[in-house]
């Protein structure tokens, strides 16, 4: 008789990342009988929702349903129908919604309420929509990359099955850059974490981890740009802002109402004698870098050492995975290679920012101008944040690995979030069991 393949015993999970600039839906899959093993969960799909982040729907909440429809229907297609009812769905909103909540708790609740009602209409096991804390965002990003890198596995291997593996169990730090916030998370070396708000204790797979994390709200790349513009327009003599962070020849009109709409620019707000101003790019990396540094207050530190704005930061330790916008921006600029030194990155940025806007548009004809125009700022911001903000040096730069995916799964907080909420990371090391029938060759 012919052997008939048994139906694969798998499970699925869905996490929506409701970020400040967009929403992405991730579908994860894992073998049901290996739930507690490390590294078995992998991403099978990413669906990027067309449009901006959910906080933008504050005046049009009744459109959230149609906005989410295509990606939720995609999930319905990808996951077998027999699994729909047992597939958990989680939505986590990050800094865009944290900012909206700062402005109005009522409006943020209304947006989340409509999101919940929309997601409840699908045949999955909807588990709720919530705004996650910056601390959670940092922690889950750290869990994700170390889970995917096999750092929680107790088995030592003589060969490497994942990139960046140094064959030791030393965890990677996590550097996450979004549109509205940025997170830094790592295990410091024998250092007490001086501020309790930045300390996390985990027991994972039988091992204790003392983790440092901080999320800098308003220091994501989009909000940092708004901050810089609000700071610089204060000292502009008229409604022309000559800006070194944009290419020579670039021009753009900005509404003052848009500039002051975000809580991130409140500290720079002033009454201006105009409703609009024009950015005129002058494309100078060094001046752009200097302007960005003014966003970081390094004059005050109540601890032994700080990042900026009086926030404790222990000495950096080990390797770091830099993902999300750290990766997307550096990938666009072709600066993700392990071989590119920090000095080389700076040189390339100087050249890139100095290129005339007309030339840039011709070279990258397929890229939306809004995004294209901001790579000079974003690249310069990344360098400023990593070097002056987090105190990486030319030497320690080689410990930063710009990571998009690990083993086919996106680096980011969503996988760690799902692993935690589905109880798939045990505190203790699971006991080894004899081979199951499915393991026989």
């Amino acid at each position: 008789t012919q052997n008939k393949a048994l139906p694969e015993n798998v499970k699925y999970g869905i996490v929506l990342d409701a970020g400040s600039s967009h929403t992405s839906l991730y579908i994860y899959k894992w073998p049901a009988e290996k739930e507690n093993d490390t590294g078995v969960v992998h991403q099978v799909e990413e669906c990027r929702v067309k449009g901006p982040g959910i906080s933008k729907f504050v005046q049009k909440v009744n459109e959230i349903g149609i906005y989410l429809t295509d990606c939720m229907e995609r999930a319905r297609e990808v996951i077998p129908r027999s699994q729909h009812q047992e597939t958990p769905v989680y939505l986590g909103a990050t800094a865009g919604m944290r900012l909206l909540r700062m402005e109005s708790e009522e409006l943020a609740d209304r947006v989340l309420d409509v999101v919940e009602r929309s997601l409840s209409n699908y045949p999955f096991d909807f588990q709720g929509a919530r705004i996650i804390t910056g601390q959670e965002e940092g922690a889950y990003g750290w869990i994700t990359i170390n889970y995917l890198l096999g750092k929680f596995s107790q088995k030592t291997r003589w060969f490497s099955i994942v990139p960046y593996e140094t064959n030791n169990q030393e965890t990677f730090g996590a550097l996450d850059l979004g549109g509205a916030s940025t997170q830094v998370t790592f295990v410091p070396q024998n250092q007490t974490i001086e501020s309790p708000d930045n300390a996390l204790q985990f027991r994972l797979y039988g091992k204790d981890y003392n983790v440092y994390t901080h999320s800098f709200l308003c220091y994501g790349k989009d909000q940092a740009l708004w901050q810089k513009l609000a700071k610089d327009i204060q000292v502009a003599s008229n409604e022309i802002l000559r800006d070194p962070c944009f290419h020579p020849g670039y021009k753009k009109v900005v509404n003052v109402s848009d500039l002051y709409k975000t809580p991130c620019t409140k500290r720079f707000e002033m009454t201006l004698p105009f409703q609009q101003f024009e950015i005129q790019g002058i494309g100078n990396y060094q001046q752009c870098h200097q302007s960005i540094l003014e966003l970081f207050n390094t004059s005050y530190c109540p601890y032994s050492q700080c990042a900026f704005n009086g926030i404790f930061l222990p000495p950096l330790q080990g390797d770091f995975g830099a993902f999300s916008a750290f990766y997307f921006v550096m990938k666009f600029l072709n600066l993700t290679s392990e071989k590119v030194s920090q000095e080389k990155v700076t040189e390339m940025m100087k050249k890139f920012c100095a290129q005339p806007w007309e030339e840039i548009k011709t070279s990258y004809a397929g890229v939306k101008e809004k995004y294209l125009s901001e790579y000079c700022f974003s690249g310069t911001y990344i360098l400023s944040l990593l070097l002056q903000g987090y105190h990486f040096t030319a030497d320690s730069w080689e410990h930063i690995h710009f990571i998009g995916k690990i083993q086919g799964s996106d680096a980011g907080w969503t996988l760690g979030y799902m692993l935690n909420l589905t109880n798939m990371i045990p505190a203790e090391q699971p006991l080894s069991t004899p081979l199951s029938h499915s393991t026989y060759v």
Partner: nanobody, 124 residues
Framework: EVQLLESGGGLVQPGRSLRLSCAAS????????MGWYRQAPGNERELVAA???????NYADSVKGRFTISRDNSKNTVYLQMNSLKPEDTAVYYC??????????????????WGQGTQVTVSS
């Protein structure tokens, strides 16, 4: 520019059906979403039903199970089949075609086109 022309409105008795049509012409490649809004006297304009370029649909709770939106891409037309009509469905129905902006500044919608509206009256 996109032009939208609605048809199919009228006076109908409660419990009966109507089918609205909206023909789109012009630069419609930039449009991902099409839908129907309605506005009763003294009320705000509300989204009734919408459909994406991939044919996925979404409905207001008040019309779920009674109204069906569909799209014929070959004819650049969107339809709203309205069954089991109630007096509270009385309103001017507007066809809308739009796409969202990806940006955190400026308006939510990058493209936003409206028809002139067609009156639907449900009365015995």
């Amino acid at each position: 520019e996109v032009q939208l022309l609605e048809s199919g409105g009228g006076l109908v008795q409660p419990g009966r059906s109507l089918r609205l049509s909206c023909a789109a012409s012009g630069d419609i490649f930039s449009i991902n979403y099409m839908g129907w809004y309605r506005q009763a006297p003294g009320n705000e304009r509300e989204l009734v039903a919408a459909i994406t370029g991939r044919g996925n649909t979404n409905y207001a709770d008040s019309v779920k199970g009674r109204f069906t939106i569909s799209r014929d891409n070959s004819k650049n037309t969107v339809y709203l089949q309205m069954n089991s009509l109630k007096p509270e469905d009385t309103a001017v129905y507007y066809c809308n075609a739009w796409d969202y902006s990806d940006y955190d500044e400026g308006p939510l919608r990058e493209y936003d086109y409206w028809g002139q509206g067609t009156q639907v009256t449900v009365s015995s």
